[in-house]
Interface confidence: low
Amino acid sequence: QLTTESMPFNVAEGKEVLLLVHNLPQQLFGYSWYKGERVDGNRQIVGYAIGTQQATPGPANSGRETIYPNASLLIQNVTQNDTGFYTLQVIKSDLVNEEATGQFHVYPELPKPSISSNNSNPVEDKDAVAFTCEPETQDTTYLWWINNQSLPVSPRLQLSNGNRTLTLLSVTRNDTGPYECEIQNPVSANRSDPVTLNVTYGPDTPTISPSDTYYRPGANLSLSCYAASNPPAQYSWLINGTFQQSTQELFIPNITVNNSGSYTCHANNSVTGCNRTTVKTIIVTELSPVVAKPQIKASKTTVTGDKDSVNLTCSTNDTGISIRWFFKNQSLPSSERMKLSQGNTTLSINPVKREDAGTYWCEVFNPISKNQSDPIMLNVNYNALPQENGLSPG
């Protein structure tokens, strides 16, 4: 049975399509191609005479068609008007005609899309935003990407208008994007430039740094305040309830005990109209007890690697202090083999390894003073490995 096949079935505008013919009969006079689903002389594209190998254009010929000796028809530089059915008529030597109909679909090369938005400066937890992918075109699939990934499943994301519109319900600060839309048809795809949202939010509860509470008289007090906010928050400071200044940082040189009190940071976002405050207590004290130098002791100072364990103890007579340990200027513990116990007074290493050899010391401190022990040296030896088979290595 005579059949035709389109290569490809879906064609991009401006490209070419080949109408292939299968099972062409023997003993032929010739054949003709027609636009449409039936033989119609007014819609003949081309005829071909086998004997003369002559192709004759018909009324529907556009000059873009080429017929081949095997009856296949090539149409170049196709337009959307070329979409549809094509009929091949084969004239056999017995003058009995045979027909076959094929079809193809021409799609446009899609333009680069763009994203329009109904609100590019939404307020967190308050506004919704609708993105629309332009232009609207027929036979087109619309896809959306957030942060270069396809849309996550979320009750806050809604697609509508044939997926052309993406709505974010109740935006959050994490919804800044970028957002891209992609349009696709069977022959082409194109993605928009990225669009970002300027989500207005905050301020969150501010944090005051550093975290220190105790200061000595004569020191400089330098406090900094930060609250996550868009646009950035405006800051002001109050001491014991009295307004001081509208800056993010507060600096008081050469403090005295009179500077003790409640320090309040006030953060304000003029767009959201929200305010947040944080209060910090600062204590300036004359009392400056010198923390005594702690003593460090080891259960043994020379150990066998991968076999022995060792306990280091930090001793002090002071009260209300904290203890921390150091090894080669690094804070401990630094591995799972090291454990602190008894309020950090004891450091246990089990088992000891070669890399544990070196200098250890402890430090005792309170809010306004600290002191450290003399160092202690830990030596790690390894026994010679026994010979497995009596052979010397080499």
Partner: antibody, heavy 120, light 113 residues
Framework: EVQLLESGGGLVQPGGSLRLSCAAS????????LYWVRQAPGKGLEWVAT????????SYADSVKGRFTISRDNSKNTLYLQMNSLRAEDTAMYYC?????????????WGQGTLVTVSS | DIVMTQSPDSLAVSLGERATINCKSS????????????LAWYQQKPGQPPKLLIY???TRESGVPDRFSGSGSGTDFTLTISSLQAEDVAVYYC?????????FGGGTKVEIK
């Protein structure tokens, strides 16, 4: 007699570019679909790209999409493969091939190949 | 994309014995327009380009000895060498030729036992 002769292979650094050519003779060049196929040393055959009779339709293997471009000059009876952003894994013998008949079909005729080596 | 899977990877057969190579496609290669299976088989000897043996799954290319035959339909195909000759030692590849996907199988090396 159908003949396909590839050229343009050689040594190139990763990230570099190379343009392969395939000169055809012995048949009506503009009537046939053409292909590039490659074979890494000691590995199997991998179809790389296809081009239609007029050059209006092209298709590529995922491994080269966006980096390689197939084209043809029917007036010169020559097929081309422009290879950009080359990687070590592009090292292979590159063959051009011709379809059996007018449409896209099995690869009836092959060239002898040209070797591309991507190495620093 | 269509994935073509060949088995076995290698095959050792005595001279004069039958060799059978299988090829499985991840989707049907049967073209409803002409009821033909769009599968080809190629033979490649060391240092040479591949040579077409069979197309449309079972149609032998002109000049190919009749000891080579192809069979199968849809997704499962077989190349059979009915009586292996010394000159048949080569790697054999199956290939989908459904436009625009021309994926090859991984190849089967045929040797003499």
């Amino acid at each position: 007699e159908v003949q396909l002769l590839e050229s343009g292979g050689g040594l190139v650094q990763p990230g570099g570019s190379l343009r392969l050519s395939c000169a055809a003779s012995g048949f009506s060049f503009s009537d046939y679909y053409l292909y590039w196929v490659r074979q890494a040393p000691g590995k199997g055959l991998e179809w790389v790209a296809t081009i239609s009779v007029g050059g209006g339709q092209t298709s590529y293997a995922d491994s080269v999409k966006g980096r390689f471009t197939i084209s043809r000059d029917n007036s010169k009876n020559t097929l081309y493969l422009q290879m950009n952003s080359l990687r070590a894994e592009d090292t292979a013998m590159y063959y051009c091939a011709r379809a059996m008949y007018y449409g896209p079909a099995w690869f009836a005729y092959w060239g002898q190949g040209t070797l591309v080596t991507v190495s620093s | 994309d269509i994935v073509m899977t060949q088995s076995p990877d290698s095959l050792a057969v005595s001279l004069g014995e039958r060799a059978t190579i299988n090829c499985k496609s991840s989707q049907s290669l049967l073209n409803s327009a002409n009821q033909k299976n769009y599968l080809a088989w190629y033979q490649q000897k060391p240092g040479q380009p591949p040579k077409l043996l069979i197309y449309f799954a079972s149609t032998r290319e002109s000049g190919v000895p009749d000891r080579f035959s192809g069979s199968g339909s849809g997704t499962d195909f077989t190349l059979t060498i009915s009586s292996l000759q010394a000159e048949d030692v080569a790697v054999y590849y199956c290939q989908s030729h459904i436009y625009p996907n021309f994926t090859f199988g991984g190849g089967t090396k045929v040797e003499i036992k």
